[in-house]
Every structure is written in C-alpha cells, then in structure tokens.
C-alpha cells in the first residue's frame, strides 16, 4: 500500500514499460526538507522488490549511483514477463527500532512488442446479419495491447473498430456491428488489423474478400413436406430460404439410420421432388443453403423436420407354419402360424390378417380375418388341404401366401438323418443333418422348429422355426434361445405334398441339474421292483438331461452302491430293477446327468422285497 | 420530438484543429448510427464520418488520419475532431442520426432521419 508519495518521488529509465531482457534505473528521490534528522548520512533509502504482492528481494546491493541522504540509483535486470512492483523506503539508521517508512513506488511492466496478426477471417451470418472477423494474435505481449480492425470497401470508405488485450481479456475478435448488403455481392473489400503497444506496433497482411465469400446464409427454416396423393414414397419438400441462395443440399435419413441421403439442388427456390422415400417410415430431413455455386460457405443445417411417411399396400409373403393334431378318428385340429412382416415390407400398420383354408378337391373354403399371429380351426381328417394367408394395413393387402397341409412326420424315407445339435454359445444352437436317404419325391425345403421343453409348452407358446433351402444342411437357431433351457428341435423335410421329420434335444449352455428326480414309489410285481418318480423341476434341470441314475445298496452297508442308468425320456416316469436280494432292505434314490456332470442325489428310499428274486 | 444541435464551428488557419459537438435531445446516442456531412457553397453534401450504434467507425479514406469521430453516451452527444485543416475543409458541418447497420449506408445521407441546423467552418490560408 503506497501512500500518495508525500516524502519523495520514484523515476524509471528508460520507461516503465521495457522488453524483456532489458535494464532498468530506478531512481529514488527524498523531497526537500524529509528525513530522519538534520543529518542527511542518517537517512539510508532501499529498494524492495514485490512480484503479486510477494516479497522477493531487497535490492540494497544494486546500487549504481547515491547522494547520501537525497536520492540512490538502483539497477534492476532479469525481470519476469509481466508486471513488478519496486517500492521505495526510507531508513533512518540511527534509530533501528523504527520499521523502515515507504517514500514512493512504481510498477515495471515487462513484455514484448506484439507480432504481426495473422490468419483473418470474416463471416457475415446471413444476408443481415453483421460482420465480425478473428485472427490470431501470435505471442501473449504481457502488456496491454489495443487491435485495430480496418475493413476497406467500395467508394473509398473505411470502418474501423477497436478492442484491445490485457492480463484480463484476450482480443482476437470483433464483431464490426454493421452488415454487408447484397447490392455489394460483387465488391472487394480488404481487411487487416493492427495491434499497437507501448513497444512496437505491427499490421497484419492485407486479406482480401467479396461478400460472397463471408456471408454465411442462415439456415433454411419452416420446413414442410407434403406427400403426392398420400404417396408413401414420393414427397416434395418445401422450405424457405434467404434471397440469394442458388444452391442448396438436402439430406434425409430414417430415424433409426447412421447414414444420410444427399441431394444437391440448384435453383430449387424452396422445393424438392423425393422419389425414393420407404413408405410408413419414420424420417428426418434437414436442408442447407449456399449464396453460390462455386464460392462461399455453406449454412448451418437446418432444424430437423421429423416426419413419417404415409402407408403403401403390403409387399413380401407371410413366413407360414402349422401343427396338426388328431383329435379323433375323423377330425384333426390345424393350428396356423406365421411372423409378422419386416416394416419394410408391412409398409404400415397391419391391422389383421386374412386366413383362408380350402379342401382342393371338394373345394371347401374355410375363411376369417385375425388381428393374431395364429389361427387354429378343427377339419374333417380327409381329404387334401390347403392354407394361405395375407396380411392387410390401411392401403390393402399383401399377396395370399400358401402352403400344403401335408402330415409333418409321415413319411419315414422323408425323415433327415444324423440330426446333431451342438450348443455354439450362451444364445445360440447349431444344429446339423444328412438329407434322407431314399426320398421318393424331392425336399422342397426343410423347417427347423424348436420349442422350450417347458411343461404347458405346447399349448402355451407357438413355435419358432426357420425355413431353410434344400441344399442347406445346418442351421444356427437363436431365436428366443436362452441358456440352461433344453429344447426338443424337430428337422422337417417337406415335398411338394409329403414331410417326414427327426427329432432331437438340445441346450446353448448346461450345468449339472440342482436335484436328483424324487422317487414316489417302489412296488414289487412278478419279482421284479419298479422304481417310480417325479422329473426335475423345469427350472433345476439346467439343460438337457441325458440319463437318470438309479442307485440303490444294502442299509448300513458301506460298500460302494449298485446303479442302474437310464436313458432320458420325458414320457418315462418308472423303471423295473431284478437284482434285488428279498428280505434284504435297501437304500434307494436318483441323480439326473446332463452333459455338465450329475445333479445331486434325491431323495432316498428304504424298500425291503418279499418274493423271491433271481 | 428530436433535436440536434451542432457547435464548435468556427475560423481557424490552415492547419489547425477544430473540435465539432453535437448535443442530442429527444433519442438516445447509444441506440443509432451518427454521421457527419459536410456542404462547400455550390457543392454537394457529402459525408465525412459515422459512428454505427456498435461503435464502429466509417471515414472516407481522403479524410482517414485528419479526423476523428466520437461518442460521449452520458452527455448524450456525438464529436469530430478536425486536424490539419486545409481551405478547401471550409463548410457547413451537419450533424445526422438514424437506424442505419449496413457499411454503405452509414454513408447515404438519405439513410438518416434527424439532421441538426449545421455549424459553419472556415479555414483560412
């Protein structure tokens, strides 16, 4: 804190400002009749030296020059950039109690002269909008730096605006606050900026440019489309845009798409025939502007128009599958199928389907329409059928798909051979077969359906399948696939009015089951012991389970038990065992294996026969 | 109703300096472009500076260097600085104000609105 130098005064040669690098005096003079006493020897003056308001040196020792007890000289050299504080005070040393007193200060700023701007750029953002150019500074100067910006145009007219930089604020862009009009869209105009400190001064290059090459038109707004006669596919686009523009770039895309649609349009004058738009999708289109053909910049893009495109008739055929199941010796139920339509191909909303069945020879017609993805109708069990859907939005309907009702499994020399189903990953099976070996009639196609073996499963959920071609003998089912599950895959073969099927078991991933099966029941007949018991819990099977194990030994007995295993099947729930001593009793229980190893044991059982056994 | 007033006019030799103010009544300096013109007897007004309500500042390049436009926003006045006069700087100066923003119209007189009475200067060789 200086006071307002009432005892002397404090003087910089060559400047208060100097370049970095540069010496500097400081001069330190006491006013006539301030002191410490009568005896001017007394009065000793220092120099102290503050960098943000830190102490950092006493310059006593840098003494060049000194009037005892009037004035010293101090020379100061290796200044920082930036700005020092030197202050003055006054020492009387013949009183050391008394804390030296300030006489006067003064701040040294150091920096260097700026460099030349470069790299000048205008824009002007739309046709009235105002002008404002950047550039870069080069160097930090350390100093307070004031830039002039000079725009020169036609009828020998010069604007001019200033801003400057300092420790606080950077000036490396003007806005000129005023607007190039397109009556001067031919017009040159030369802009440079000076930049003037107390070191030096220096210009930029001269930078030429037309209006046309600044002005950035604002982006085109009030974006509309309106489709042709309700047309799914063709639209016109429709915009407004600045005067001037002659070019503009459209770009479209559906919503869900990473890559965009470009057109480039000239003289469009804010109209766009589109031909290629998907029907019943859902778009964004956004629009450009440029004020020539050839020069200047493009607009920003214009605010998204998200729009959907009207509907069209359905295109494509229905995937079609069925189930047949006799319900008696004269009437069997049909149970239809089928995947909705890709979007592209629903082209709208499908608001239900139209199923017909017809018996071709006696040309019964069975026809309905559902909102579902099935159709199940009981029909006489003779007699040649066939089925065939269409799926219907607004605008119509798609082709009739059909398809032969023929006995899935029925023809044995139809049924694939070697059918394999290996688990690929955590959501996928790959399953394999041969082609039949005898067929009488060629393999259309084969289907491969799959479905959780879940009870209920059947009636509960529709199968999944994939059509695969007849060259083909693999397929990679991942639909709804999800591991620990076993799955009963059927490959069927089907001609123009046969099937013949294989059936096999799979799972995309197992472990060993969480519980052996629960015996139930051990009854004796014919000297003979049957085993009775209730599978695993769908969810503690955890795969496809191969085998059980009936392990049985002698209660008490320490010796290694006795087992029987048997191959896995869903409809089995009991099994006979004749190796049994009577009168003897036993301990008995059960362990299910999957390809992961065996499940715990289940419950045990004592059983004591009483016939006599072989 | 708006009212500008110019003064500072006067006799001066060639080169010296004049300073030319003009007080504002009625609209606010800060809100729109001020000009100066300036008409020789049997001539054509033509224009001799502008401020834009941004600051910016237009001369013609014939004066560039010898004149200098300003703004006092408090006062609500507007200044030219004249140096270096010269005979042939002898005139009527007016004062002018109006909504202008683009760079050519700062130097249309039919672009302003308000125009003060003018004050006469006179530099003798």
């Known amino acids: 804190n200086i006071d307002v130098c009432k005892l002397g005064t404090v003087t910089v040669q060559p400047a208060p400002v100097i370049p970095l690098g540069s010496a500097a005096n400081i001069s330190c003079s006491l006013n006539p009749k301030q002191g410490c006493s009568h005896y001017p020897s007394s009065n000793e003056l220092i120099l102290l030296k503050f960098v943000n308001d830190v102490l950092v040196e006493n310059l006593h020792g840098k003494k060049v020059h000194d009037h005892t007890g009037h004035s010293s000289t101090f020379q100061v050299t290796n200044l920082s950039l930036g700005m020092t504080l030197f202050v003055c005070k006054l020492n009387c040393s013949n009183s050391q109690k008394k804390p030296p007193v300030p006489v006067c200060g003064v701040e040294i700023s150091v920096g260097v002269a700026p460099e030349p701007p470069q790299n000048i750029s205008c824009v002007q953002e739309g046709e009235n909008g105002t002008v404002a150019c950047s550039w870069n500074s080069g160097k930090v100067t350390y100093l307070k730096t004031n830039y002039t910006l000079q725009l020169s145009g036609p009828n020998n007219l010069t604007c001019q605006k200033q801003c400057f930089s300092d420790n606080r604020q950077n000036c490396n862009r003007l806005d000129l606050g005023i607007n190039l009009s397109p009556d001067l869209a031919e017009s040159r105009f030369i802009v440079r900026v000076t930049a003037i400190n107390d070191l030096g001064n220096s210009s930029s290059l001269p930078h030429t440019f037309t209006f046309l090459d600044i002005v950035i038109p604002l982006p085109p707004w009030d974006i509309r489309i309106n489709f042709l006669n309700a047309s799914g596919s063709r639209g016109t686009l429709q915009w407004e845009d600045e005067g001037q523009v002659v070019l503009n770039q459209l770009r479209y895309q559906p919503l869900n798409s990473t890559s965009w649609n470009m057109v480039n349009a000239t003289n469009a004058k804010g109209k766009y025939d589109l031909r290629d738009l998907r029907p019943f999708t859902e778009y964004e289109f956004q629009i450009s502007s440029k004020l020539h053909l050839s020069g200047g910049s493009w607009s920003n893009w214009s605010e998204s128009l998200r729009t959907r495109t009207p509907e069209e008739e359905p295109v494509g055929i229905l995937d079609i599958w069925y189930m047949k199941q006799d319900i008696d010796y004269d009437r069997q139920q049909i149970s239809l199928f089928w995947k909705s339509l890709n979007p592209s191909e629903a082209r709208g909303k499908i608001l239900h389907y139209q199923v017909t069945l017809q018996e071709v020879t006696k040309k019964t017609t069975l026809q309905n329409t559902t909102r579902h993805t099935s159709w199940t109708r009981v029909i006489p069990r003779t007699g040649a059928w066939t089925a065939s859907v269409s799926a219907a939005n607004s605008k119509g309907a798609s082709a009739p798909t059909h398809i032969n009702i023929v006995d899935l499994c029925g023809t044995g020399l139809l049924a694939p051979h070697q059918v394999s189903a290996k688990s690929e990953n955590m959501d996928n099976i790959l399953v394999t077969w041969q082609p039949p070996k005898k067929a009488d009639s060629a393999v259309r196609e084969y289907i491969v359906e799959w479905r959780a073996l879940q009870p209920g499963s059947i009636t509960k959920f529709p199968p999944h399948w994939l059509r695969i071609p007849p060259d083909n003998m693999s397929a990679l089912i991942s639909e709804n696939i999800k591991p620990y599950i076993c799955y009963e895959i059927r490959v069927h073969a089907l001609s123009e009015s046969q099937g013949g099927c294989s059936s096999i078991r799979g799972d995309s991933k197992h472990k060993a089951p969480v519980s052996g099966p629960h015996i139930t029941a051990i009854t004796e007949k014919k000297e003979r012991l049957f085993i009775s018991w209730t599978h695993i819990p769908f969810p503690e099977q955890r795969g496809c389970i191969l085998h059980y194990r009936i392990y049985w030994k002698e209660r008490d007995s320490t010796a290694q038990p006795e087992l029987c295993e048997i191959q896995y099947r869903r409809s089995q729930n009991s099994h006979p065992i004749s190796s049994l001593q009577p009168r003897v009793t036993y301990v008995l229980w059960m362990t299910a294996v999957t390809a992961a190893g065996e499940s715990p044991q289940g419950n045990e059982r004592e059983f004591c026969p009483q016939g006599k056994a072989n | 109703q708006v009212q500008l007033q110019e003064s500072g006019g006067g006799s001066v030799q060639a080169g010296g300096s004049l300073r030319l103010s003009c007080a504002v009544s009625g609209r606010t300096v800060s809100d729109y472009a001020m000009g100066w013109f300036r008409q020789a007897p049997g001539k054509e007004r033509e224009f001799v500076a502008a401020?834009?309500?941004?600051?910016?500042?237009v001369y013609p390049n014939s004066m560039k260097g010898r004149i200098t436009i300003s703004r006092d926003n408090a006062k609500n006045a507007v200044y030219l600085q004249l140096n270096a006069l010269k005979p042939e700087d002898t005139a009527v100066y007016y004062c002018s104000m109006g909504p202008i923003a683009t760079f050519q119209g700062l130097a249309r007189q039919n672009e302003y609105h308000y125009w003060g009475q003018g004050t006469q200067v006179t530099v003798s060789s």
């Open positions: 401020m834009s309500s941004s600051e910016t500042t």
